[in-house]
């Protein structure tokens, strides 16, 4: 078999509060119940965990209390936002989806989606 | 469905040698890291070395540099972990890892990796 394919935008520009979202969409060769989608974060050559969720087909995504991304899935695509970025998060951010049941297990990673953070310019002093 | 199917493990003494062989199967993609893990009791497993299907980038674990060589024969779709001058701390369960990468993620790296061998087990022992 090929690589499971999965697709996800080339670029996003987070909003002035330090919110991206971003939908990762994956073309299942199997009939999948359990679905884990794992957020990695590759910048110079490091690659780190930003966040991951397990769910099961129809259900939402469930994530940590303490993470920092939120999810929805619909079909064979998630819909993925990430919060309080700030301008130092900024880098590739590569959708990894796993097929964990029934078997046989299917692994695809996206070719990541870059995103752009931009800190806000403080307000300056009110004279008032 | 992807098959890694590793050989090779045993039995060695102490500054001996072993040649650890994984063959893939079930996988059509030209662009993939393929390597060795490790994983010894009580321990997590960790990365010993890694090579890049396209180009042959490699990557070695700092412990085993200039000690184990990998190498990989893309008619057979089988790497090879050539392992000499064991020690007692090489002693583990040997897994081969597949990592189905496009040229923009950085090379070898574990997170990457989800298809897995049933593992061979080396012991470095006298």
């Known amino acids: 078999c090929k690589a499971m394919h999965v697709a996800q935008p080339a670029v996003v520009l987070a909003s002035s509060r330090g919110i991206a979202s971003f939908v990762c969409e994956y073309a299942s060769p199997g009939k999948a119940t359990e679905v884990r989608v794992t957020v990695l974060r590759q910048a110079d050559s490091q690659v780190t965990e930003v966040c991951a969720a397990t769910y099961m087909m129809g259900n939402e995504l469930t994530f940590l209390d303490d993470s920092i991304c939120t999810g929805t899935s619909s079909g064979n695509q998630v819909n993925l936002t990430i919060q309080g970025l700030r301008a130092m998060d900024t880098g590739l951010y590569i959708c990894k989806v796993e097929l964990m049941y029934p078997p046989p297990y299917y692994l695809g990673i996206g070719n990541g989606t870059q995103i752009y953070v931009i800190d806000p310019e403080p307000c300056p002093d009110s004279d008032f | 469905e992807v098959q890694l199917v590793e050989s090779g493990g045993g039995l060695v003494q102490p500054g001996g040698s072993l040649r650890l062989s994984c063959a893939a199967s079930g996988f059509s993609s030209d662009y993939y890291d393929i390597g060795w893990f490790r994983q010894a009791p009580g321990k997590e497993r960790e990365m010993v070395s890694c090579?890049?299907?396209?180009?042959?980038?490699?990557k070695y674990a700092d412990s085993v540099k200039g000690r184990f060589t990998i190498s990989r024969d893309n008619s057979k779709n089988t790497v090879y972990l050539q392992m000499n001058s064991l020690r007692a701390e090489d002693t583990a369960v040997y897994y081969c890892?597949?990592?189905?990468?496009?040229?923009?993620?950085?090379?070898?790296?574990?997170?990457?990796?989800?298809?897995w061998g049933q593992g061979t087990r080396v012991t470095v022992s006298s």
């Open positions: 090579i890049r299907s396209s180009g042959g980038s490699t």
């Open positions: 890892g597949l990592a189905p990468i496009s040229p923009v993620h950085a090379v070898c790296n574990q997170h990457y990796f989800g298809y």
